[in-house]
């Protein structure tokens, strides 16, 4: 029944003070997406993207979360506390829910620059 698959940006790292895009993509299903929920590691909701009502960013994250691109989410002004798991949950008819996981590591600026310099292309 649930034929779809969720592809995510996987494990990502970003600089403290910078921004990062969290992206999930649902493929290989005829199902219709009615809502996408974005949750943080402690299960608190960051945002909901509803097919009819559009985006709702939860008050605690209003200053630092921007909707998009697409069904994704942009986290801004990153702090070390933002390190952890993020989940996208796709509500689809008639398949049900699909869930994707992203792990974000926020690095001190100097560390991020150092690790980026030595990344294998």
């Amino acid at each position: 029944m649930m034929t779809g698959t969720i592809e995510t940006t996987g494990n990502i790292s970003a600089k403290k003070g910078g921004s990062v895009i969290l992206q999930c993509h649902l493929s290989s299903t005829m199902a219709q997406v009615t809502q996408v929920n974005w949750e943080q590691h402690d299960h608190s909701l960051l945002a909901i993207r509803n097919a009819e009502l559009g985006w709702h960013i939860y008050p605690a994250f209003k200053d630092r979360v921007a909707p998009g691109p697409g069904l994704g989410l942009t986290l801004q002004s990153l702090t070390m506390n933002d390190t952890g798991e993020y989940f996208c949950t796709y509500h689809t008819y008639p398949d049900g829910t699909y869930r994707g996981r992203i792990f974000l590591e926020v690095l001190e600026s100097s560390v991020a620059e150092h690790s980026a310099r030595f990344q294998i292309p």
């Epitope: 005829m30 219709q32 009615t34 809502q35 097919a51 009819e52 509500h91 008819y93 008639p94």
Partner: antibody, heavy 122, light 106 residues
Framework: QVQLVQSGSELKKPGASVKVSCKAS????????MNWVRQAPGQGLEWMGW????????TYAQGFTGRFVFSLDTSVSTAYLQISSLKAEDTAVYYC???????????????WGQGTLVTVSS | DIQLTQSPSFLSASVGDRVTITCRAS??????LAWYQQKPGKAPKLLIY???TLQSGVPSRFSGSGSGTEFTLTISSLQPEDFATYYC????????FGGGTKVEIK
């Protein structure tokens, strides 16, 4: 208000085709999946399948493949059911029904058309 | 396909009676169950979704319960306008309906 209005009753001869329309109003048509349900005289409800109103992709339930076609015209917020090579056993009321709710916990057919009676008789 | 079995198929009752209709699923469907009311010549009307959530505008004498494979629709005090046929529907997989329960005047 949110409603689905279907085309009127049809009397057809065996072998003919029929196209039933279902016009939506009061909501964003492409935000909610659309279903088709058949009810033969004196019988229960039978799910025929559904159409993704975003992509136009139809899915047909067992027993409703081949002669049955679901389609859309999103410019006029209308879903269509076409039945070809009609048989006497296709005589029934056909309903369109919207899937309401946004999260899976809330899914249900919350808005129905008034139904279209298709009678197949020689 | 998930089969739904409703019981009873027919039910005779009087105004003011408490009425209970059962719906059994052939496999677990969590709480993905809805109940509909249909009157002759009319389209079905949604009463309850998610097994126990009352649809907006539906009188509070209607209630639903259950999860997994066994569900019930209860009408606490039957009113004249409640004589109709009731259907359960599962939405855990491709939707299917129960066979219906006709509530008649005794």
């Amino acid at each position: 208000q949110v409603q689905l209005v279907q085309s009127g009753s049809e009397l057809k001869k065996p072998g003919a085709s029929v196209k039933v329309s279902c016009k939506a109003s009061g909501y964003t048509f492409t935000s909610y999946p659309m279903n088709w349900v058949r009810q033969a005289p004196g019988q229960g409800l039978e799910w025929m399948g559904w159409i993704n109103t975003n992509t136009g992709n139809p899915t047909y339930a067992q027993g409703f493949t081949g002669r049955f076609v679901f389609s859309l015209d999103t410019s006029v917020s209308t879903a269509y059911l076409q039945i070809s090579s009609l048989k006497a056993e296709d005589t029934a009321v056909y309903y369109c029904a919207r899937v309401g709710g946004y999260s899976v916990d809330e899914y249900a057919f919350d808005v129905w058309g008034q139904g279209t009676l298709v009678t197949v008789s020689s | 396909d998930i089969q739904l079995t409703q019981s009873p198929s027919f039910l005779s009752a009087s105004v003011g009676d408490r009425v209970t209709i059962t719906c059994r699923a052939s496999q677990g469907i969590s709480s993905y169950l809805a109940w509909y009311q249909q009157k002759p010549g009319k389209a079905p009307k949604l009463l309850i979704y998610a097994a126990s959530t009352l649809q907006s505008g539906v009188p509070s004498r209607f209630s639903g319960s259950g999860s997994g494979t066994e569900f019930t629709l209860t009408i606490s005090s039957l009113q004249p306008e409640d004589f109709a046929t009731y259907y359960c529907q599962q939405l855990s997989s491709y939707p299917t309906f129960g066979g219906g329960t006709k509530v008649e005047i005794k």
